[in-house]
Interface confidence: low
């Protein structure tokens, strides 16, 4: 039930823990030595989008045929571990997180696709995927190495009103510049009585410069 089994029977069992009494830091430090638990793989790094959305896959190697699975996302930052969200699902069915949860997810076989929303720069940290095979017995627990999610607050787009003033000024300037050029050209042509030539065409800038809308997440899968 705890990650304290090494006190009683060392590393002789390849079974998973049933509960979570010790801190995650302790757990992560000792699980490779003492608790050869169910393997859980997740990407090492994910960059959240500028809208604060991060997605990653949590894959577990099921040692048996589980019908009820519980997935928990834990966040570790500065040795503090907090539960971000959790969902229990029956194999073949969808994950259902609480309505007010910042997590959503879908399951496919032994894979869970997790999406965490509403992340800010201060939410940067290690997000650990914990998978429990709840039923039928025996119970298994697997913990991933964690996905480092980097959240970068995007540079704010320039103020739209300010942009309009700039565009108006530039457009006006260009209009008067082209008007002036046309007038000068016409007067020269009239003086020379030469055929009419076309005025100068200047490509206008777009009405509003495109801000960078989204950083594409990338990840490095762990084998």
């Amino acid at each position: 039930m705890a990650c304290l089994g090494f006190q009683r029977h060392k590393a002789q069992l390849n079974l998973a823990t049933r509960t979570w009494p010790c801190t995650l830091l302790f757990f992560l430090l000792f699980i490779p030595v003492f608790c050869k638990a169910m393997h859980v793989a997740q990407p090492a790094v994910v960059l959240a989008s500028s809208r604060g959305i991060a997605s990653f896959v949590c894959e577990y190697a099921s040692p048996g045929k589980a019908t009820e699975v519980r997935v928990t996302v834990l966040r570790q930052a500065d040795s503090q571990v907090t539960e971000v969200c959790a969902a229990t699902y029956m194999m073949g069915n969808e994950l259902t997180f609480l309505d007010d949860s910042i997590c959503t997810g879908t399951s496919s076989g032994n894979q869970v696709n997790l999406t965490i929303q509403g992340l800010r720069a201060m939410d940067t940290g290690l997000y650990i995927c914990k998978v429990e095979l709840m039923y039928p017995p025996p119970y298994y627990l697997g913990i991933g190495n964690g996905t480092q999610i980097y959240v970068i607050d995007p540079e704010p787009c320039p103020d739209s009103d300010f942009l309009l003033w700039i565009l108006a000024a530039v457009s006006s300037g260009l209009f008067f510049y082209s008007f002036l050029l046309t007038a000068v050209s016409l007067s020269k042509m009239l003086k020379k009585r030469s055929p009419l030539t076309t005025g100068v065409y200047v490509k206008m800038p777009p009405t509003e410069p495109e801000c960078e809308k989204q950083f594409q997440p990338y990840f490095i899968p762990i084998n």
């Epitope: 039930m1 705890a2 009683r8 079974l15 823990t17 009494p21 003492f34 608790c35 048996g64 025996p138």
Partner: antibody, heavy 110, light 98 residues
Framework: VQPGRSLRLSCAAS????????MHWVRQAPGKGLEWVVV????????YYAESVKGRFTISRDNSKNTLYLQMNSLRAEDTAVYYC??????????????WGQGTLVTVSS | PGEPASISCRSS???????????LDWYLQKPGQSPQLLIY???NRASGVPDRFSGSGSGTDFTLKLSRVEAEDVGVYYC?????????FGGGTKVEIK
């Protein structure tokens, strides 16, 4: 207790971190062998019952009080037994029932 | 006393899980006492259990061996499968000393 009546058993735990362990109730009818009754997960979220008590017995726990409960309703004569609470020694892995209570005799008779 | 003894336990279904462990425990209930754990997962001796007790077997056939029986070993020995609910105990084997 009379048939059809209810009874609640308590098991007070000490000497270990109660909230870390799953707990079982096992019973033994007079002169008979051991019969597993029910298990409750460390956090109380999962409970599994033997068919013979399903729908009549309810297991619960109060981790703040380090106490395990067994609510027995609609008692029958065949429920007469010594009831033991047992700790599931799954510290790290499944490891059997390593601590047992001293047992409580429940007699159902009219 | 001092003689070896063995108790067998046979399951109708295999207790060998895909993780490689046999979900079978052995318990001893001494007269007038609560049961006590001897062996878990087929062959793992519980804490404080003398090394004269050993468990072996896999799948459906299991054996509890006592290398030399002592007076304190008398009682009823139960095997229990813990692979799936409902957990079930064997009928028990009574060990007495002549």
């Amino acid at each position: 207790v009379q048939p059809g009546r209810s009874l609640r058993l308590s098991c007070a735990a000490s000497g270990f971190t109660f909230s870390n362990y799953a707990m079982h109730w096992v019973r033994q009818a007079p002169g008979k062998g051991l019969e597993w009754v029910v298990v409750i997960w460390h956090d109380g979220n999962n409970k599994y019952y033997a068919e013979s008590v399903k729908g009549r017995f309810t297991i619960s726990r109060d981790n703040s009080k380090n106490t395990l409960y067994l609510q027995m309703n609609s008692l029958r004569a065949e429920d007469t037994a010594v009831y033991y609470c047992a700790r599931d020694q799954g510290t790290g892995w499944y490891g059997g029932f390593d601590f047992w209570g001293q047992g409580t005799l429940v007699t159902v008779s009219s | 006393p001092g003689e070896p003894a063995s108790i067998s336990c046979r399951s109708s279904q295999s207790l060998l899980h895909s993780n490689g462990y046999n979900y079978l425990d052995w318990y001893l209930q001494k007269p007038g006492q609560s049961p006590q754990l001897l062996i878990y997962l087929g062959s793992n001796r519980a804490s404080g259990v003398p090394d004269r007790f050993s468990g072996s077997g896999s799948g459906t056939d299991f054996t509890l061996k006592l290398s030399r029986v002592e007076a304190e070993d008398v009682g009823v020995y139960y095997c229990m499968q813990a692979l799936q609910t409902p957990l079930t105990f064997g009928g028990g084997t009574k060990v007495e000393i002549k």
